[in-house]
Interface confidence: medium
């Protein structure tokens, strides 16, 4: 289980149309459910229940986004429509270039994602927890324009991390 180095870039627009970017660095783990690859895309926060629906009108995004899913406590969803792996697959089918799961409230999901699949996804499936997950969700919950950059080695240049 390799470390995934995740940079989350929040874009703040200026009157001139330029963007100031604030980069927050955090770490997660590549799970065996997906590939150990770099990926980058605009963050789309996905509701775990939103991944249950399988109709066209739920295919809401263009290709190449990074799905962020905060998993609920298992007792809040005792009969999930899909396994965690199934949810990752559904997100990739809908055009996600990577999926990041916040497993803080559902640590059992780590084992599910690492059980190893005969047919792993060709895109990275990363999980984060604890302080890293809090940092990530603090940015995502702002519902502002943000991108995630996932790398399997540390960023070459030390980033000036801006803690949200």
């Amino acid at each position: 289980k390799e470390t995934a180095f995740v940079e989350v870039v929040l874009f703040e627009s200026s009157p001139s149309g330029d963007y100031t970017t604030y980069t927050t660095g955090l770490t997660g783990r590549f799970s065996r459910a997906g590939a150990t690859l770099s990926a980058e895309g605009e963050i789309v926060q996905m509701h775990p229940l939103g991944l249950c629906n399988n109709n066209d009108e739920e295919d809401l995004y263009e290709y190449g986004w990074v799905g962020v899913v905060k998993l609920e406590q298992p007792e809040l969803d005792p009969k999930p429509c899909l396994t965690v792996l199934g949810k990752a697959k559904r997100a990739v089918q809908r055009g996600a270039t990577a999926v990041i799961f916040d497993v803080s409230e559902n640590p059992e999901a780590i084992d599910q994602l690492n059980q190893g699949s005969e047919d792993p996804l060709k895109r990275p499936v990363v999980y984060v927890k604890g302080a890293d997950a809090i940092k990530l969700m603090n940015i995502v919950n702002k519902q502002k324009v943000a991108r995630a950059r996932i790398q399997h080695r540390p960023p070459r240049q030390p980033t000036e991390y801006f803690d949200m």
Epitope: E12, S14, P15, H47, L49, E72, N141, Q143, K144
Partner: antibody, heavy 121, light 109 residues
Framework: EVQLVESGGGLVKPGGSLRLSCAAS????????IHWVRQAPGKGLEWVGR??????????EYAAPVKGRFTISRDDSKNTLYLQMNSLKTEDTAVYYC????????????WGQGTLVTVSS | DIELTQPPSVSVSPGQTASITCSGD??????VHWYQQKPGQAPVLVIY???QRPSGIPERFSGSNSGNTATLTISGTQAEDDADYYC???????????FGGGTKLTVLG
Amino acid sequence: EVQLVESGGGLVKPGGSLRLSCAASGFTFSDYGIHWVRQAPGKGLEWVGRIKSKTDGGITEYAAPVKGRFTISRDDSKNTLYLQMNSLKTEDTAVYYCARAIYYLEAFDVWGQGTLVTVSS
Amino acid sequence: DIELTQPPSVSVSPGQTASITCSGDSLGSYYVHWYQQKPGQAPVLVIYRNKQRPSGIPERFSGSNSGNTATLTISGTQAEDDADYYCATYDSSSWWNVFGGGTKLTVLG
């Protein structure tokens, strides 16, 4: 068919109360956050408030002009949303719409047909 | 708190391109949604997340958002596009949804 249907509007005196209902069908109501939006006669849209899904804590939030006077609640067993309006003012006169929010996007993809509330003496 | 400003009215000839603007402080940092409303009807979502089009919305509707301005563009405007259009966003500082004042699009002729 995915549908929201409001009811309960009518004429009420200033200072009075009214409860609006919004009946949902054609989708899993409990999974979604639902909002109330109003539109005064000849005016634009104004957001009133929201209630999140139970899995998101069922949190309610309100716009400043109605905070403390309006209360949003939901009964997932009946697929119904409610808006309890107290201490009504003439400026609350509007068509009230309930609207479903796309997960986390706060964009409203399904709207009801609206119900008119008139506050007048 | 963010405030959204729209022109009260825009006129366009059939077949031409209509552009409706929505301005707000650093609006390009936010996701903007657009609604169409015809008289006596409920609003309809035509663009969400700056540029995404829900299923069933014609391809002539498109959106962009940069700097302080979001724009709804209707190319090859048709008579049925005559309606009020509202921009909206979510203000994460107040946890409120905010609507612009609305723009009346008139398709001439």
